[in-house]
């Protein structure tokens, strides 16, 4: 039950995280005009990964796409790439994790296969989250560098008479959305990996063969590596799954290394 909950929660958290990464990538407010200690202007500038916008106080907003690819800064291209990789990995991870969910039955899929799929999706979510966090952090670093550079020459005098105000940019809402979303995707991925440990079979993938001794019930597994003793074992008829993996509603009556996840 705990495994199912962990897996389900991991899926939901990752889903929210990936939705957030997509939202952040599409948002226009990656960097916004710094209004602190700046002359009050009738326009508000903000920029995204794909276009820059200007909102006039009169209510009009005009956005222009970056219609060049080669003319864009390498850092911006890198951030775009990281965010897209994060989205793609996250989307694939979501697809894989849907089939890996313990509460969803697909044909006669073995629990070991579900465990592998859960681990795969978990790793994908972790990498996706890291990509998003990295992308947002690279952009934030770029902003900080540019901010202090523009602060150094905030006002560039023209012939000592005319002043040109340089627009400074600070962190936009998309950065915070990206950080949170990346973190959620990462957490979801970790939860999926933890859930995978609970789904994984104890030892091998061979069919378990039960030999009933006259004393207490001992289940022998071929290969002779380990014998599990069932203290107070559940006597209900249960289907024996490949590798002796437990069903989701089975009451565990003996401690296992997976009970502590």
């Amino acid at each position: 039950m705990a495994v199912t909950a962990c897996q389900g929660l991991g899926f939901v958290v990752s889903l929210i995280g990936i939705a957030g990464i997509i939202a952040a990538t599409c948002m226009d407010q990656w960097s916004t005009q710094d209004l602190y200690n700046n002359p009050v202007t009738a326009v508000f500038n903000y920029q995204g990964l794909w276009r820059s916008c200007v909102r006039e106080s009169s209510g009009f907003t005009e956005c222009r796409g970056y219609f060049t690819l080669l003319g864009l800064p390498a850092m911006l291209q890198a951030v775009r790439a990281l965010m897209i990789v994060g989205i793609v990995l996250g989307a694939i991870g979501l697809l894989v994790s849907i089939f890996a969910l313990k509460c969803i039955r697909i044909g006669s899929m073995e629990d070991s296969a579900k465990a592998n799929m859960t681990l795969t999706s978990g790793i994908m979510f972790i990498v996706s989250g890291l990509c998003a966090i990295a992308g947002v952090s690279v952009f934030a670093n770029m902003l900080v560098t540019n901010f202090w550079m523009s602060t150094a020459n905030m006002y560039t005098g023209m012939g000592g008479m005319v002043q040109t105000v340089q627009t400074r940019y600070t962190f936009g809402a998309a950065l915070f959305v990206g950080w949170v979303a990346g973190g959620l995707t990462l957490i979801g991925g970790v939860m999926m990996c933890i859930a995978c440990r609970g789904l994984a079979p104890e030892e091998t993938n061979y069919k378990a063969v039960s030999y009933h001794a006259s004393g207490h019930s001992v289940a022998y597994k071929p290969g002779g590596f380990k014998a599990s003793t069932g203290f107070g074992s559940n006597t209900k008829n249960k289907k024996i799954y490949d590798g002796g993996a437990r069903t989701e509603d089975e009451v565990q009556s003996y401690p296992s290394k997976h009970d502590y996840v």
């Epitope: 005009q33 002359p39 820059s52 005009e62």
Partner: antibody
Framework: QVQLKESGPGLVAPSQSLSITCTVS????????VSWVRQPPGKGLEWLGA???????NYNSALMSRLSISKDNSKSQVFLKMTSLQTDDTAIYYC???????????WGQGTLVTVSS | DIVMTQSPSFLTVTAGEKVTMSCKSS????????????LTWYQQKPGQPPKLLIY???TRDSGVPDRFTGSGSGTDFTLTITSVQAEDLAVFYC?????????FGSGTKLEIK
């Protein structure tokens, strides 16, 4: 079509307050900002302040302490209140609709306010 | 506050002539975000409210004849009337539409001979 009409008292005694109403039609105050501009007889234009679509306001720093701009979206009215009037406040007061490039695309006919005892 | 300086104060021309008037601002009106200059030109005929001619320094408002052309960038701007008509008799004002408070130039009065 877009129309703006100012209505004011005409004559105001010195040190008294001035209240002007700008009634608009053809557009919504929730979508467009309205500015107030005045013009003393035979002189140039002076921007007084503005109230924007979202309700935020900007004022001329020289007049900020005496000025107050508000609006009633449902009645399509914008209000200008100015305190402590002096004779040099005698002017034609215009309200104008904000447009692209923070320009004033549509103007009212103006209302002449004379400050005199 | 931004100071807008217009020159000349008066212009007397004959109909059909080309006329140019200047407007200078104390600070650049160029917005780096969209590379647009927030300078506006108005025409005020006697006894009438001002009429918008040009915004963003060079964009004509709808219904404005194409004989009116705005140009310039940063701090120096020009309004050109290619072929002055009798009905162009007016005062032309430039306006800083970038910094608060918005400020107007003192105007250029155009008179027709």
């Amino acid at each position: 079509q877009v129309q703006l009409k100012e209505s004011g008292p005409g004559l105001v005694a010195p040190s008294q307050s001035l209240s002007i109403t700008c009634t608009v039609s053809g557009f919504s105050l929730t979508s467009f900002g309205v500015s107030w501009v005045r013009q003393p007889p035979g002189k140039g234009l002076e921007w007084l302040g503005a109230i924007w679509a979202g309700g935020n306001r900007n004022y001329n720093s020289a007049l900020m302490s005496r000025l107050s701009i508000s609006k009633d979206n449902s009645k399509s009215q914008v209000f200008l209140k100015m305190t402590s009037l002096q004779t040099d406040d005698t002017a034609i007061y215009y309200c104008a609709r904000g447009s692209y490039g923070s320009s004033f695309a549509n103007w009212g006919q103006g209302t002449l306010v004379t400050v005199s005892s | 506050d931004i100071v807008m300086t217009q020159s000349p104060s008066f212009l007397t021309v004959t109909a059909g002539e080309k006329v140019t008037m200047s407007c200078k601002s104390s600070q650049s009106l160029l917005n780096s975000g969209n590379q647009k200059n927030y300078l506006t030109w108005y025409q005020q005929k006697p006894g009438q409210p001002p009429k918008l001619l040009i915004y963003w320094a060079s964009t004509r408002d709808s219904g404005v004849p194409d004989r009116f052309t705005g140009s310039g960038s940063g701090t120096d701007f020009t309004l050109t009337i290619t072929s002055v008509q009798a009905e162009d008799l007016a005062v032309f004002y430039c306006q800083n539409a970038y910094f608060y408070p918005f400020t107007f130039g003192s105007g250029t009065k155009l008179e027709i001979k």
